[in-house]
């Protein structure tokens, strides 16, 4: 178990021409807040994939009012870190989405209004317990600067938070075969229940006797880097079973290389061979290159041969954004007939048909809805001789002519907070609830008769998949 921490340093106009207008004005003062969504692994991001590692919302930032005539400065930020607790092993590789939201504080009917200002996404490798990694991401004309790290919650330690520490039984030394627990030198490593010999740096287990490898490592004991099949250390007696050399004690013990780097000895000390995307003496500095696969949805990465040069994602048809993370509106192909309104739902195209028409592409004439006009993309729904308008998100009333706050219907259950923007609704759940609408109380294992989860339990729930 542990916590992913995100520190936002600045959010403001990026370099170059086309500086964005300030999101706030004297008439509409506003303040910012941020949402982070974490997913495990480097797999392509599914359009509706949940924030399976967890999600978090920041506090609101200070109220900001634009000074007339002044360029948009870096905007005032919320205090503190965004913290996403994770319960299982830290996966080592993860995808993130960071959203910048604006809360307008003008004379809004029904309270403040929220809108999404910018959204950045990326994929990174990160070892728990390492230093802060710095990053810069751009979304349109906006630039977001931030740092992040993953740290283990005691008693867990290690790059995946899978090793356990416990207080020393004697003040002088740890028990037989147990090492001091860096960085908690006054504690000792708890006996591992993993398979004997399983690498404490590169392997972990969720059940006794198994040895599962972090990305970049292989072999029955997770001691072999994926990049090479030969052994790294030239010392020690030969092992007949693997043909490898078993290292004795040396400067590489405990692997000082972060982020999956492999250690080799030098005459004076050690040297880290870093995976692509990381550099520095101990591979502690992260820089993203094309080799890290930063382009989502099959995008082609160009440039970025070294971490200091930028990469560019050339997106396939249907996707856009600096990381090809946004879907292009496929409705430009005009698939809806008879004047139907096309909606791109991500996983499918949908046609909202004009009154009198129905079918997946509005190809069928209907009598029940003839002469019945639903405005703003509403659909006339017929059934049993009756007909009504089923309104698109954000509209209501008999003919869908009235603007409606999607959150006014209170879709979030059990005290969840609702946020609305162009692609749908977001529910931020209160502790102890899960589901996109926070509709399910979490019942911890073996306690299914309880009415809800105990206070303070935070499920790593998908919430809404933006």
């Amino acid at each position: 178990a542990g916590v992913f921490e995100l520190q936002i340093h600045s959010f403001g106009p990026g370099p170059g021409p086309g500086a964005p207008r300030s999101p706030c004005s004297a008439r509409l003062p506003c303040r910012l807040f941020f949402r982070v969504c974490l997913k495990p692994g480097l797999s392509e991001e599914a359009a509706e994939s949940p924030c399976a590692l967890g999600a978090a919302l920041s506090a609101r930032g200070p109220v900001y009012t634009e000074q007339p005539g002044a360029p948009a400065p870096d905007l005032p930020l919320p205090d503190g870190l965004l913290q996403v607790p994770f319960r299982d092993a830290w996966p080592g590789t993860f995808s993130f989405i960071i959203e910048t939201w604006r809360e307008e504080l003008g004379d809004q009917i029904g309270g403040p209004a929220w809108s999404l200002l910018a959204r950045v996404a990326g994929r990174r490798r990160l070892a728990a317990g390492g230093p802060w990694a710095r990053d810069i991401q751009r979304a349109g004309a906006w630039e977001l600067r931030f740092s992040y790290r993953a740290r283990c919650e005691p008693p867990a330690v290690g790059t995946a938070c899978t090793r356990l520490c416990r207080p020393r039984s004697a003040p002088s030394r740890c028990g037989p075969g147990l090492r001091p627990c860096a960085p908690l030198e006054d504690e000792c490593e708890a006996p591992l229940v993993c398979r004997a010999g399983c690498s404490p740096e590169h392997g972990f287990c969720e059940q006794p006797g198994e040895c599962r490898c972090l990305e970049g490592w292989t072999g029955p004991l997770c001691t072999v880097p994926v990049s090479t099949s030969s052994c790294l250390s030239p010392r020690g007696p030969s092992s007949a079973t693997t043909g490898c050399l078993v290292p004795g004690p040396g400067p590489c013990d405990g692997n000082p290389c972060a982020n999956g780097g492999s250690c080799s000895e030098t005459p004076r000390s050690f040297e880290c061979t870093c995976p692509r995307g990381f550099y520095g003496l101990r591979c502690e500095v992260s820089g993203v290159t094309c080799a890290d696969g930063p382009c989502f949805n099959g995008g082609l990465c160009v440039g970025g041969a070294d971490p200091d040069s930028a990469y560019i994602c050339h997106c396939p048809p249907g996707f856009q954004g600096s990381n090809c993370e946004k879907r292009v509106d496929r409705c430009s192909l005009q698939p809806c007939r008879n004047g139907g309104l096309c909606l791109d739902l991500g996983h499918a195209l949908r046609c909202r048909c004009r009154a009198g028409f129905a079918g997946p592409r509005c190809e069928h004439d209907l009598d029940d809805c003839a002469g019945r006009a639903c405005a703003n993309g509403g659909t006339c729904v017929e059934g049993g001789g009756a007909h009504r308008c089923s309104c698109a998100l954000g509209f209501g009333g008999r003919d869908c002519r009235e603007r409606a706050d999607p959150c006014a219907a209170r879709p979030c259950a059990h005290g969840g907070r609702c946020y609305a923007h162009f692609s749908g609704l977001v529910c931020a759940c209160a502790p102890g609830y899960m589901g996109a609408r926070c509709e399910f109380p979490v019942h911890p294992d073996g306690a299914s008769a309880l009415p809800a989860a105990p206070p303070g339990l935070r499920p790593g729930d998908p919430q809404r998949y933006l």
Epitope: D88, V381, L393, P411, A413, A436, D445, S448
Partner: antibody, heavy 122, light 106 residues
Framework: EVRLVQSGAEVKKPGASVKVSCKAS????????MNWVRQAPGQSLEWMGI????????SYNQKFRGRVTLTVDKSASTAYMELSSLRSEDTAVYYC???????????????WGQGTTVTVSS | DIVMTQSPKSLAVSLGERATINCKAS?????VSWYQQKPGQSPKLLIY???NRYTGVPDRFSGSGSATDFTLTISSLQAEDVAVYHC?????????FGQGTKLEIK
């Protein structure tokens, strides 16, 4: 093709436990909640519970009073439903069903397993 | 728990004719989904969000209603539509279903 394939029929004695498996394929297992729904002979559908396959968080129908346990094996893309202290009225077909959300956050079961018949008889 | 009541319990309709099944919730559920279950098979999704037809479902199936009263309509009954139809609500925990409506050919 998205598929949920369940384990075979089971015959159990009253008081015993049964564990039914549901193997998912054709999609990323951890991207969708998994539900369990049962149907007794000649009866309607009855929701038993839901699990978040990545975190393992669960929510159960109180009717089952702690008798049901939902688990997953992420590496095998498989969900499990264990029902203990079986009685004759637990004789039913047990289904796993993937949970999906529409644009207004309306939840629905879009893919169902083929069902596993559990017979409880002395 | 929210009680979902379907009517009628069984229904016989001639081929090509319209079939209508109702579902009433004991309190506001916002929307329902409809499932078709043929003999010996698992349920299949037809309609979600009260009126959205699921991918691949023929357009003779339509759903309507809101709050507590919902309707599934088959505009022109086909032989392959013989099945039990279930409504279900996912608005409120615990999720609940109607008792089912058996549709046959007259």
């Amino acid at each position: 093709e998205v598929r949920l394939v369940q384990s075979g029929a089971e015959v159990k004695k009253p008081g015993a436990s049964v564990k039914v498996s549901c193997k998912a394929s054709g999609y990323t297992f951890t991207d969708y909640y998994m539900n369990w729904v049962r149907q007794a002979p000649g009866q309607s559908l009855e929701w038993m519970g839901i699990i978040n396959p990545y975190q393992g968080d669960t929510s159960y129908n109180q009717k089952f009073r702690g008798r049901v346990t939902l688990t997953v094996d992420k590496s095998a893309s498989t969900a499990y439903m264990e029902l203990s202290s079986l009685r004759s009225e637990d004789t039913a077909v047990y289904y796993c069903a993937r949970y999906h959300y529409g644009p207004h956050l309306e939840g629905y079961f879009d893919v169902w397993g083929q069902g596993t018949t559990v017979t409880v008889s002395s | 728990d929210i009680v979902m009541t379907q009517s009628p319990k069984s229904l016989a309709v001639s081929l090509g004719e319209r079939a209508t099944i109702n579902c009433k919730a004991s309190e506001n559920v916002g929307y329902v989904s409809w499932y078709q279950q043929k003999p010996g098979q698992s349920p299949k999704l037809l309609i979600y969000g009260a009126s959205n037809r699921y991918t691949g479902v023929p357009d003779r199936f339509s759903g309507s209603g809101s709050a507590t009263d919902f309707t599934l309509t088959i505009s022109s009954l086909q032989a392959e539509d013989v099945a039990v139809y279930h409504c279900g609500q996912s608005y409120s925990y615990p999720l609940t279903f109607g008792q089912g409506t058996k549709l046959e050919i007259k």
